[in-house]
Interface confidence: low
């Protein structure tokens, strides 16, 4: 079973609504872990959840807390809680083949669609992650840059296939 | 009774939720009519609603249309309809003391808080506008900059002090 799998809740489904409710040209800063689009998840997941936590916490500050219904604030607040749980879980499992990327995370700007595609990819990694099978080396070409996969459909409603 | 007053509906109340649901540092372009903060409404209202219509229509394109509940798209769509109604109404009343500003509208950048404060001021103008009393000249000092009118209420339901 995937590490920390029990920490991932169905709140992630709210991401669809959140992405639709954010301006398409609004830019979200994320320290992107180089290679997460091509390397196995054990190479980047421990750093990525920390960076996602930071970015989502910062994003939360951009909204006002209104009580009625599903607001952007309430959705992001839930996502922060999910990711913070995963950060804690990763710490608990830090000896279980979760490796540090050899390159430092780089601050990049992403549209909501791009940012939450990375978010989804990270969440999916916990669902699929099996310690025993993750033994490959974490080596990535220095020419890679994030999120340039032409296979990503932008005609789908808002969500967003996992990144290649 | 104010000109076009019957075109102003309670959908405007949704602005509270909309402003809370937009990133505080997101910038919205609006061609601002110089002097609307200090001059009587007949001097600027006819131009301002046209510019608000353009800006809101542009803003609408930044969001996806999701069916469930009050989304940003659905709120902005309602506001576009309100303002477009007012544009038509202004055309019908163009002979009724509605003057053209002597200065051309200038494209400026506003946070959601600022933009919808101007929106609110414009909507209020229709509620308060009485043709007979609006006879003053439309002259504005070149040193003025917009929205410094202490008369603009920031305690109204959705409006909102200027953002940093």
């Amino acid at each position: 079973e995937g590490i920390c799998r029990n920490r991932v809740t169905n709140n992630v489904k709210d991401v669809t609504k959140l992405v639709a409710n954010l301006p398409k040209d609004y830019m979200i800063t994320l320290k992107y872990v180089p290679g997460m689009d091509v390397l196995p998840s054990h190479c980047w997941i421990s750093e990525m959840v920390v960076q996602l936590s930071d970015s989502l916490t910062d994003l939360l500050d951009k909204f006002s807390n209104i009580s009625e219904g599903l607001s952007n604030y309430s959705i992001i607040d839930k996502l922060v809680n999910i990711v913070d749980d995963l950060v804690e879980c990763v710490k608990e499992n830090s000896s279980k083949d979760l490796k540090k990327s050899f390159k430092s995370p780089e601050p990049r700007l992403f549209t909501p669609e791009e940012f939450f595609r990375i978010f989804n990819r990270s969440i999916d990694a916990f669902k699929d992650f099996a310690v025993a099978s993750e033994t490959s080396d974490c080596v990535v070409s220095s020419t890679l840059s994030p999120e340039k996969d032409s296979r990503v459909s932008v005609t789908k409603p808002f969500m967003l296939p996992p990144v290649a | 009774e104010g000109i076009c007053r019957n075109r102003v509906t309670n959908n405007v109340k949704d602005v509270t939720k909309l402003v809370a649901n937009l990133p505080k540092d997101y910038m919205i372009t609006l061609k601002y009519v110089p002097g609307m903060d200090v001059l009587p409404s007949h001097c600027w209202i006819s131009e301002m609603v046209v510019q608000l219509s353009d800006s809101l229509t542009d803003l609408l394109d930044k969001f996806s249309n999701i069916s469930e509940g009050l989304s940003n798209y659905s709120i902005i769509d309602k506001l576009v309809n309100i303002v477009d109604d007012l544009v038509e109404c202004v055309k019908e009343n163009s002979s009724k003391d509605l003057k053209k500003s002597f200065k051309s509208p200038e494209p400026r950048l506003f946070t959601p808080e600022e933009f919808f404060r101007i929106f609110n001021r414009s909507i209020d103008a229709f509620k308060d506008f009485a043709v007979a009393s609006e006879t003053s000249d439309c002259v504005v000092s070149s040193t003025l900059s917009p929205e410094k009118d202490s008369r603009v209420s920031v305690t109204k339901p959705f409006m909102l002090p200027p953002v940093a």
């Epitope: 700007l109 | 910038m27 400026r108 900059s145 917009p146 202490s150 940093a164």
Partner: antibody, heavy 115, light 105 residues
Framework: LVESGGGLVQPGGSLRLSCAAS????????MSWVRQAPGKGLEWVSA????????YYADSVKGRFTISRDNSKNTLYLQMNSLRAEDTAVYYC???????????WGQGTLVTVSS | QMTQSPSSLSASVGDRVTITCRAS??????LGWYQQKPGKAPKLLIY???SLQSGVPSRFSGSGSGTDFTLTISSLQPEDFATYYC?????????FGQGTKVEIK
Amino acid sequence: LVESGGGLVQPGGSLRLSCAASGFTFSSYAMSWVRQAPGKGLEWVSAISGSGGSTYYADSVKGRFTISRDNSKNTLYLQMNSLRAEDTAVYYCARRDFFAHFDVWGQGTLVTVSS
Amino acid sequence: QMTQSPSSLSASVGDRVTITCRASQGIRGYLGWYQQKPGKAPKLLIYSASSLQSGVPSRFSGSGSGTDFTLTISSLQPEDFATYYCAEYIRMPYTFGQGTKVEIK
């Protein structure tokens, strides 16, 4: 805009800067603090909305500095705690116009952090 | 991040001077230009990339959008010798360029 409160302080110490505003409706404007280390460029430090309801900070000062305002006194404040040598700079208060970024500046007040 | 060039330049009165500012990411038109003289506070010259601030001489002009921006002084005057900063304000934290010092040749 007239700043005051600068001076020499030891590392780890505290200082409170003030900025007295006049000539405009203070509560209608967001205000910011911008600093400039000796011989260096400008660095935005913090901002506060017209009502005081929203505050913003640069990462370099987050958790150490607190911006506030008293609209009844037309005064902007910057409470600086846990000061470091790298906080040494001239601190300017600036008015943030609706469109024009920082359109009015104070003359600045020098803060020196040294043992 | 905002990168200004050149970091300094020497020019004569009457010269046409151009300073460039490049943003690491697109900032549309959310850019201002400031002038600062030694021991003085900065002064706003241009906002929204190309709008001249009230009271600023018309020899100053700004252009550009996206990532590349330019400040032009059409005919340099003695009082224009100073340091010039660009600044973006698409979102906080606002960031300034490192400055361009315009000196007398």
